[in-house]
């Protein structure tokens, strides 16, 4: 996250930190995600497309720090990794950039709700906040485009939803932006998501409930003028989410 502020997981208790195990045994941070039911985390397909082996991934819930433990955190294996079959990224844009991870602890359990672990509500079909609404993004992504390392502490910031008409202007992203995407940015272009924030939540208040409105997907640079963050529009993927999680009880739809 460029700009914004450091936070703790209590403020974003649905945030999932996804890591990849390498052959040599090292573990690196991959992407963020959001807990949408006790057994399911939602993220972005582009995070996994190059290494789609579920056994390679570890998911932490209740974690405030990148490389050290947080009291009450839970560690999970990925029982099922579902990537969108129509994902594509021929150009700058990522299409259908959504993924589901079914999580299971070593003991065979899903997430146990606590002060630091909670699910986030999904929107209803095609129901999004008005453009201009302030929403939160969270992640362990870079604090500057040029940084080599990710920050150790979880960060969050506030961005405003931008209309499709504005985002499709030629000096923004033109027709790269589709109706299955949402754009959001800081009016001063000072704060934004960046590399490492992918897959994480764009959360907005909708009818008084904190709702997962978007998934961090793509953008040109980070916090560049006229180059907003682009997010997978969750309200347009509810049938896909339902069809892949339907055997699971307790999904907050």
């Amino acid at each position: 996250i460029i700009g914004g502020e450091f936070t703790t997981i209590e403020n974003q208790p649905w945030f999932a930190a996804i890591y990849r195990r390498h052959r040599g045994g090292s573990v690196t941070y991959v992407c963020g995600g959001s807990l949408i039911s006790p057994c399911w985390v939602i993220s972005a397909t582009h995070c996994f497309i190059d290494y789609p082996k579920k056994e390679d991934y570890i998911v932490y819930l209740g974690r405030s720090r990148l490389n050290s433990n947080t009291q009450g955190e839970m560690k999970f294996e990925v029982e099922n990794l579902i990537l969108h079959k129509d994902y594509s990224a021929d150009t700058l844009a990522h299409h259908n950039d959504i993924a589901l991870l079914k999580i299971r602890s070593k003991e065979g359990r899903c997430a146990q709700p606590s002060r630091t672990i909670q699910t986030i509500c999904l929107p209803s079909m095609y129901n999004d906040p008005q453009f201009g609404t302030s929403c939160e993004i969270t992640g362990f992504g870079k604090e500057n485009s040029t940084d080599y390392l990710y920050p150790e502490q979880l960060k969050m910031t506030v961005v405003k939803l931008i209309s499709h008409r504005e985002c499709q202007q030629p000096h923004y992203y033109g027709s790269e932006v589709t109706t299955k995407m949402l754009c959001a940015a800081d009016p001063q272009w000072k704060t934004d998501s960046c590399q490492g924030d992918s897959g994480g939540p764009l959360v907005c208040s909708l009818q008084g409930r904190m709702t997962l409105t978007g998934i961090v997907s793509w953008g040109r640079g980070c916090a560049l003028k006229d180059k907003p963050g682009v997010y997978t529009r969750v309200s347009h993927f509810l049938p896909w989410i339902r069809s892949h999680t339907k055997e699971e009880n307790g999904l907050a739809l």
């Epitope: 594509s88 150009t91 700058l92 589709t178 040109r220 980070c222």
Partner: antibody, heavy 115, light 112 residues
């Protein structure tokens, strides 16, 4: 094996029209965007335009030729087209079609605009 | 529109020696996922261009490992570790982060 076979080039007078075709084989044509690039004699490469796959709206993007050139596709025949209207002498070039934004290139077809 | 500037424009090389071509962009070519939307092509005499490197540093299938791409943001380099006679031609960089896509002017590699 991916193949892009181009046709439709030739000599044409200024102000007239020409349609280039790019017939694809060896891959699922409908899944891919298609691009056109041109190269004036003895010069460098110039990007002409691009058409997305139908799954992503089949929308087009153009360079400076916008308004005179139109890119279209017929997925049932695996053909991409470049319709060139109001041709000018400076449009004289070898035109290449490309699978996606960058991958496989056709053999090129020469368009000469001269009176 | 994004301007790509290649240097040198002409590059005479002895076979077996390394070669390096630079491509500078007027704007960043990096997206926020860390990918650099810059490709390198070789156009051999009388042939269509062929893709060598995509997304800044990924070799296209079938491209010999003596070719490598590096760089990030606005500065990119194509390196040939040991030039062979078959490497002669014109090398182009191309950005595809923003429409209209644009090419560098080309670098002509010739054998000394």
């Amino acid at each position: 094996e991916v193949q892009l076979v181009q046709s439709g080039g030739g000599l044409v007078k200024p102000g007239r029209s020409l349609r280039l075709s790019c017939t694809a084989s060896g891959f699922t044509f409908g899944d891919y965007a298609m691009s056109w690039v041109r190269q004036a004699p003895g010069k460098g490469l110039e990007w002409v335009g691009f058409i997305r796959s139908k799954a992503y709206g089949g929308t087009t993007e153009y360079a400076a030729v916008k308004g005179r050139f139109t890119i279209s596709r017929d997925d049932s025949k695996s053909i991409a087209y470049l319709q060139m209207n109001s041709l000018k002498t400076e449009d004289t070039a070898v035109y290449y079609c490309i699978r996606g934004a960058n991958w496989n290139w056709g053999q090129g077809t020469l368009v000469t605009v001269s009176s | 529109e994004i301007v790509l500037t290649q240097s040198p424009l002409s590059l005479p090389v002895t076979p077996g020696e390394p070669a390096s071509i630079s491509c500078r962009s007027s704007q960043t070519l990096m997206n926020r996922n860390g990918n650099n939307f810059l490709d390198w092509y070789l156009q051999k005499p009388g042939q269509s261009p062929q893709l060598l490197i995509y997304l800044g540093s990924n070799r296209a299938p079938g491209v010999p490992d003596r070719f490598s791409g590096s760089g990030s943001g606005t500065d990119f380099t194509l390196k040939i570790s040991r030039v062979e006679a078959e490497d002669v031609g014109v090398y182009y960089c191309m950005q595809r982060i923003e429409f209209p896509y644009t090419f560098g002017q080309g670098t002509k590699l010739e054998i000394k």
